[in-house]
Amino acid sequence: IRAEKAMVDGSWLDLAKRSKLEAQPFAHLTINATDIPSGSHKVSLSSWYHDRGWAKISNMTFSNGKLIVNQDGFYYLYANICFRHHETSGDLATEYLQLMVYVTKTSIKIPSSHTLMKGGSTKYWSGNSEFHFYSINVGGFFKLRSGEEISIEVSNPSLLDPDQDATYFGAFKVRDID
Amino acid sequence: IRAEKAMVDGSWLDLAKRSKLEAQPFAHLTINATDIPSGSHKVSLSSWYHDRGWAKISNMTFSNGKLIVNQDGFYYLYANICFRHHETSGDLATEYLQLMVYVTKTSIKIPSSHTLMKGGSTKYWSGNSEFHFYSINVGGFFKLRSGEEISIEVSNPSLLDPDQDATYFGAFKVRDID
Amino acid sequence: IRAEKAMVDGSWLDLAKRSKLEAQPFAHLTINATDIPSGSHKVSLSSWYHDRGWAKISNMTFSNGKLIVNQDGFYYLYANICFRHHETSGDLATEYLQLMVYVTKTSIKIPSSHTLMKGGSTKYWSGNSEFHFYSINVGGFFKLRSGEEISIEVSNPSLLDPDQDATYFGAFKVRDID
């Protein structure tokens, strides 16, 4: 019976460890600045790192600029987006800016896109200052199904701060769906 | 066999509870305003409360102004930093302010510091208004190893809002490293 | 003994699943714009959706404009609040605005309210721009007891963005109290 108990304990420990790891997908994706679109209109950001520096991914997939859910669950999603301008970069087309981020969810089954979270600010970046900076942070708890895709849209992408500590988004699974 | 099963269940329940608690370090540290450094340049904030009001810590250590990781894992890190100025608070020398936060990680083994997250804004705080306020929030999911240290750097520390609901940072472990 | 082991495994799997689900209450509440109070002073927002669109709730209760904790634990709380004004909405009473959010906790036993988190900004929304927008995000990790209530207060509620992706708050349980 002792041996049997040890076996039960062992199999359980194994199962617990395995299920715990399997149950917790995550991703932290950082901006790939080599391919940031220009312009001031709202665009989808498709170039992100998933395996260098702070960027990492597990039990989720990054493909075609989208973070793909592989496992049903409730996830905490977040994004941090930084915009900046220095006078040495040249003049801004306008001093009145709308600096925005939209975290969207796309379902392949129903090919439609929905905004889960948005944030940002209108800004007046006057020429009296040599440097301007602004960051947005959004976060929320959402039910995601396998196959659904998360993507990031921003306005004024040419003003994005390309640092990995500045412009990133991510997700981690918190619990299963009942 | 029933007794044995009860023993298995009991030991498992105990193990599950124990491992669950051990596996989830956390901290929520609030600003200690009695010792905020002066100056406008980027400074490291070293005085935080860990055991009063909303501040708390478990399975992590607070020492020398840094939050020390005691257990390898993936953590969600966050910071909320508020800046404020009232005309009665003191004299501003410039209306143009760079209000920033940097969440940094230091490894003792490799004595180097890296910024995990940054946020903030350039602001124009004119004398036409008697009160000014601005808050920054950042958050992200990071792999942390035992012994690594998390610290907070800000610009314009003398403008920090000293309330516990205003200026704080924290972390909680979400999952083990595979 | 094999049958007994299967029974142990089965009961454990059941217990683990059950306890895991029970241990993780959550809520994501989105603004109900049909009942936003007017004015510019600080008000408590009492109308939120809990079961439509992105809004959802489990093992927590929404009542009288407050999110009620049903289970002791450490929770991550968050809020995203968006303010906006378009010139077609009419003139602003003042160009100098204080756009703020306060996440408060009320204990029924001790009928007092305490602010857990605050964020926001003073803004100068001049008539030179036809559209203004600003978002606040706050988040933090707090110990909550059964029966405690979480509510949201904002300044300038008439400027709130009524979209479900814009103005929301939520919570999810991360771990038990030791």
């Epitope: 009296n128 200052s129 040599e130 | 010792d35 905020i36 450094p37 002066s38 100056g39 406008s40 100025h85 608070s89 003191g90 004299d91 501003l92 020398a93 410039t94 209306e95 143009y96 302010l97 124009y124 004119s126 004398g127 036409n128 314009n156 003398s158 403008l159 | -």
Partner: antibody
């Protein structure tokens, strides 16, 4: 080279007025708060006035409040001090100084050579 | 107003000496104290700010310390060009106030 050059000092009768100027060069004037500091003959230093980089914050000690007016013209990189109702105790070398430390904790990091103001009948 | 009391008001020292000047604030000023050097007929020059930070270009023989109400300026090895008057100043709050000065003379 960062430089501040004061001018406009001289002899004035009690009750009279004088306007001091400070020409700045070698740095972006519009991004710095500026001050006037004075030093009576054989005495210590006394802060007289401060103006923020954009000119919307102005500060004086009680000793000169209501009599002195600080101003700036960022397009001309020039700081001014208009002194009215002058008294004998206002006799001093007046220094123009640049502020560093931005917010509440600012100090004076660059000084001009000073201009002498003598109030006497 | 915060009163800054400097001591001594004057001192005599030789080249190579270690010189210490103290400044006492009438109330807590945290670490917001600056030190200036002034030579006859010249403008003051910033040496130290925020109690212990050396300003750009200031030789490392000059150091500052202290917090709260008690502050010290130390010249580790006095050089001929260091004979001057030294002023402390609190930059904690307005009105900005200076100490009365310490004149360092050749012995």
């Amino acid at each position: 080279e960062v430089q501040l050059v004061e001018s406009g000092g001289g002899l004035v009768q009690p009750g009279g007025s004088l306007r001091l100027s400070c020409a700045a060069s070698g740095f972006t004037f519009s991004r710095y708060g500026m001050s006037w500091v004075r030093q009576a003959p054989g005495k210590g230093l006394e802060w007289v006035s401060t103006i923020s980089s954009g000119g919307s914050y102005i500060y004086y000690p009680d000793s000169v409040k209501g009599r002195f007016t600080i101003s700036r013209d960022n397009s001309k990189n020039t700081l001014y001090l208009q002194m009215n109702s002058l008294r004998a105790e206002d006799t001093a070398v007046y220094y123009c100084a640049r502020l560093d430390g931005y917010n509440y904790r600012w100090y004076f990091d660059v000084w001009g050579q000073g201009t002498m103001v003598t109030v006497s009948s | 107003d915060i009163v800054m009391t400097q001591s001594p008001s004057s001192l005599s020292a030789s080249v190579g000496d270690r010189v210490t000047i103290t400044c006492k604030a009438s109330q807590d000023v945290s670490t917001a104290v600056a030190w200036y050097q002034q030579k006859p007929g010249k403008a003051p020059k910033l040496l130290i700010y925020s109690a212990s930070y050396r300003y750009t270009g200031v030789p490392d023989r000059f150091s500052g310390s202290g917090s709260g109400t008690d502050f010290t300026l130390t010249i580790s090895s006095l050089q001929p060009e260091d004979f001057a008057t030294y002023y402390c100043q609190q930059h904690y709050s307005s009105p900005r106030t200076f100490g009365g000065g310490t004149k360092v003379e050749i012995k």
